[in-house]
Interface confidence: low
């Protein structure tokens, strides 16, 4: 056959569905790799053909889409389930073509079972809410395109295993949830379960994804450096271990890049002759506040080395702060002989 | 470790409070209850405060009590304390990060005497 | 508000026995359910929450079971040392707090 363009094995799109729930996937050509659309494709005469490799199997073989109540069928660019089975996991190719184009792509498609809990190992996404913050919404994922708007489904909110009814801070609102205050007792991974008619069928929509309160941005402030600080002097002979760790707490911010670094008379470590070593270890609270520590090390610390400036840097979103340790050389105690030496010269 | 305090004996409309001090963790990382134990009778809980400063009452009480923190204690006033209120009042730590709400860690309690 | 009604109020066993203590709420609180053990001049001590799971170091003796109006706490080779009154709690975030009346248990 001629040649195809062909994408490989899309990893980075690895898909989960549940078993015996519609699903709908898109072909990731229009998405990820050409820059044009289905339609845009379609009329200039392209074909896009779908085929798929059974787990386990090497051999790539056509999809069936003469299946009983047409249970696999493709609409544009899109492949559909109705429903899945167990045995529809596989790497799953989508090919556009035509005499003188050809492009494909493949991605693996894994259909995943679940308990009366919704616990299954599928890959959930995290919803982040800020504590105590005012009202905040989630909204039930991946749902469009399933039912035209004209029918109305029923959605129920199930917080772990249970229904939520009654539950004094969180209210389901149709595809959203509204948590009137987030609290640490609301983290948790939340399901709503779509059930909607189609061609006298009832289907089961579930979406689980795991909620996470954290930080809110009213309290969120610049870094703050413990250590080193004013009242800690590391005070050092030559030949000695120079150990200074540098510990900062950020507040959770979204979205923020936090960082520390040290500077040794104004340069990078990185940048200076002297043989330093940097270690970093970081921490996380409850609500994803992060306390990052660099310990910087200088294993035989020089009398040049005890004249250096160290200052530990940090920055987030919030601001920039820096301070610097103080370090000293350790004064070595008056040999006893000598005072009295002088002692008896100065009578 | 919680350890409270301020427990007496009062007469009846004095207002009281309790405090509990806790070390070896952060009040802004656990909720944090306040139960009490009537001579000879069960538990009751009173109340809650969570991490963030928002409070939740038991509904018998009828607003008697209030609780607040700062940054190393919890506190319980008990506004307007009737002869019902004798009791001794523990402090809890709720168990951490799970929804399941569960008292993990107790202090030894304080003995509050409301007699004319 | 939720009611917690605990059953039998007192109970004796001997040492290497079995006890069962009940639990009844008055309405639906799914798995939100602790359990306690008080010793006299003590604070209560978590034994189980979430109407099963056993708080760390508490001896696999304890168990915990039920769901929704219906729990139990079963001790199982009974020691001396488990004289004590035992309490269940709601934990369920609606109608948090509310204690049973406790079940003294004596070992004989």
């Known amino acids: 056959s001629e040649r195809c363009d062909d994408w490989g094995l899309d990893t980075m799109r690895q898909i989960q569905v549940f078993e015996d729930e519609p699903a709908r996937i898109k072909c990731p050509l229009f998405e990820h790799f050409l820059k044009f659309n289905y339609s845009t494709a379609h009329s200039a005469g392209l074909t896009l053909i779908w085929y798929w490799t059974r787990q386990d199997r090497d051999l790539e073989e056509p999809i069936n889409f003469r299946l009983p109540e047409n249970r696999i069928s493709k609409e544009k660019d899109v492949l559909w389930f109705r429903p899945t089975l167990l045995n529809d996991t596989g790497n799953y190719t989508c090919m556009l073509r035509n005499t003188t184009y050809c492009s494909k792509v493949a991605f693996p498609l894994e259909v995943v079972q679940k308990d009366s809990c919704f616990n299954s190992p599928m890959k959930l996404p995290v919803h982040k809410l800020y504590i105590e913050y005012g009202i905040q919404r989630i909204t039930c994922p991946n749902v469009d395109g399933y039912f035209p708007s004209s029918v109305k489904p029923t959605i129920t909110w199930y917080m772990g295993c249970y229904k939520i009814q009654n539950f004094n801070n969180v209210i389901p609102e149709g595809m959203n949830l509204s948590f009137l205050i987030a609290l640490i007792s609301n983290n948790g991974n939340y399901t709503c379960v779509v059930t909607y008619p189609e061609n006298g069928r009832t289907f089961h929509l579930t979406r689980t994804l795991t909620v996470k309160v954290v930080g809110s941005p009213k309290n969120a402030v610049p870094p703050v450096i413990h250590s080193p600080n004013d009242h800690v002097v590391y005070e050092k002979e030559p030949g000695e271990e120079l150990l200074i760790p540098c510990t900062v707490y950020f507040s959770f911010l979204m979205d923020s890049r936090n960082e520390v670094w040290w500077t040794i008379d104004g340069k990078k470590p990185d940048d200076i002759t002297i043989d330093v070593t940097i270690n970093e270890s970081i921490s996380h609270s409850r609500t994803e506040d992060e306390t990052r520590t660099q310990i910087l090390s200088i294993k035989k610390v020089t009398s040049e080395d005890l004249k250096r400036s160290y200052v530990c840097h940090a920055r987030s979103a919030k601001g920039e702060v820096a301070k610097a340790a103080k370090v000293k050389q350790k004064v070595p105690a008056p040999r006893y002989t000598v005072e009295l030496a002088c002692g008896f010269g100065a009578t | 470790s919680l350890e409270e305090s301020g427990g007496r004996l009062v007469t009846p409309g004095t207002p009281l409070t309790l405090s509990c001090k806790v070390s070896?963790?952060?009040?802004?990382?656990?909720?944090m209850s306040w139960v009490r134990q009537t001579p000879g009778k069960g538990l009751e809980w009173i109340g809650t405060?969570?991490?963030?400063?928002t409070t939740a009452y038991a509904s018998w009480p009828k607003g008697r009590f209030t609780i607040s923190k700062t940054s190393t204690t919890v506190d319980l006033k008990i506004t307007s304390p009737t002869k019902e209120d004798t009791a001794t009042y523990f402090c809890?730590?709720?168990?951490?990060?799970?929804?399941?709400?569960?008292?993990?860690?107790w202090g030894q309690g304080t003995l509050v005497t409301v007699s004319s | 508000d939720v009611v917690m009604t605990q059953t039998p109020a007192s109970v004796s066993e001997p040492v290497g026995g079995t006890v069962t203590i009940k639990c009844q709420a008055s309405?639906?609180?799914?798995?939100?359910l602790s359990w306690y053990q008080q010793k006299p001049g003590q604070p209560p001590k978590l034994l189980i929450y979430?109407?099963?799971d056993l708080e760390s170091g508490v001896p696999s003796r304890f168990s915990g079971s039920g769901y929704g109006t219906e729990f139990t706490l079963t001790i199982s080779d009974l020691e001396s040392a488990d004289a004590a009154t035992y309490y269940c709690?709601?934990?369920?975030?609606?109608?948090?707090?509310?204690f049973g009346g406790g079940t003294e248990v004596v070992v004989k």
């Open positions: 809890a730590r709720l168990q951490g990060a799970n929804y399941y709400n569960s008292l993990a860690l």
């Open positions: 070896g963790f952060s009040l802004s990382s656990y909720d």
């Open positions: 405060i969570y991490i963030g400063g």
């Open positions: 309405q639906s609180i799914y798995s939100f």
């Open positions: 979430a109407a099963s």
């Open positions: 709690q709601c934990n369920y975030i609606i109608d948090y707090g509310a």
